[in-house]
Amino acid sequence: LVPHLGDREKRDSVCPQGKYIHPQNNSICCTKCHKGTYLYNDCPGPGQDTDCRECESGSFTASENHLRHCLSCSKCRKEMGQVEISSCTVDRDTVCGCRKNQYRHYWSENLFQCFNCSLCLNGTVHLSCQEKQNTVCTCHAGFFLRENECVSCSNCKKSLECTKLCLPQIENVKGTEDSGTT
């Protein structure tokens, strides 16, 4: 089975790599534009140069292309806590990231928000904070994990999942209360 190709892929596949079919004359293969440039005019004939122009400020192309316009540079989402790691150039989009000791939480494939890495107070670091994952904490005895923070078992209500983790503590408290002097 031949995989389905879009019209542009079909047109490009007839020409050698780095070239594309002239949209008005399918007997002509024009050279693609280098990254950082875009297609201003198709080549007038075989062996003649494609008219490529450099992207204007605020736009880019990251690979060889025959785009009629450069792509707009991405903007880092300040409301998501993002910071600019590297600014946009004619051949590379803006790179956004998080500050030191923060991780990315993805809301969708391309949208992330920055959050501070957990410090594991009242616990130990099981896995260090990574670019796309918070620290994984293991809590000390008498504490349970809630929203990746170690919370005292004294805050464990019967209805919460912590009852299993805090059960020995709860029983110990009951035990000391029950073993009053007579």
Epitope: H105, W107, S108, E109, L111, Q113, F115, S118, N134, R146, E147, N148, E149
Partner: nanobody, 117 residues
Framework: EVQLLESGGGLVQPGGSLRLSCAAS????????MLWVRQAPGKGLEWVSG????????YYADSVKGRFTISRDNSKNTLYLQMNSLRAEDTAVYYC??????????WGQGTLVTVSS
Amino acid sequence: EVQLLESGGGLVQPGGSLRLSCAASGFTFEEYNMLWVRQAPGKGLEWVSGIGPSGRETYYADSVKGRFTISRDNSKNTLYLQMNSLRAEDTAVYYCAKGSITLFDYWGQGTLVTVSS
């Protein structure tokens, strides 16, 4: 089959409060981001708030920051939205939505919140 059932909407006076709930089923609730989105009369969808699988990560639109609080109870497969200091501009149908790589892929039938005196 993914099912999301919102409740808790109604008519409330400006400055009042409401708590919306969303009962989820048909997927592993604790593994997904969950969101609240709303649609005001004659307007498009607006992402109001989101919460990560553990409940630690939260997002609020600027328009609701400091007034709304999102929370979840993974043991009950339920998402909540506590709405305080409600304004006329909060009038909308509120939808609970399951997170996905495209932000969300399933949402409920919605619950109407009307803020009016």
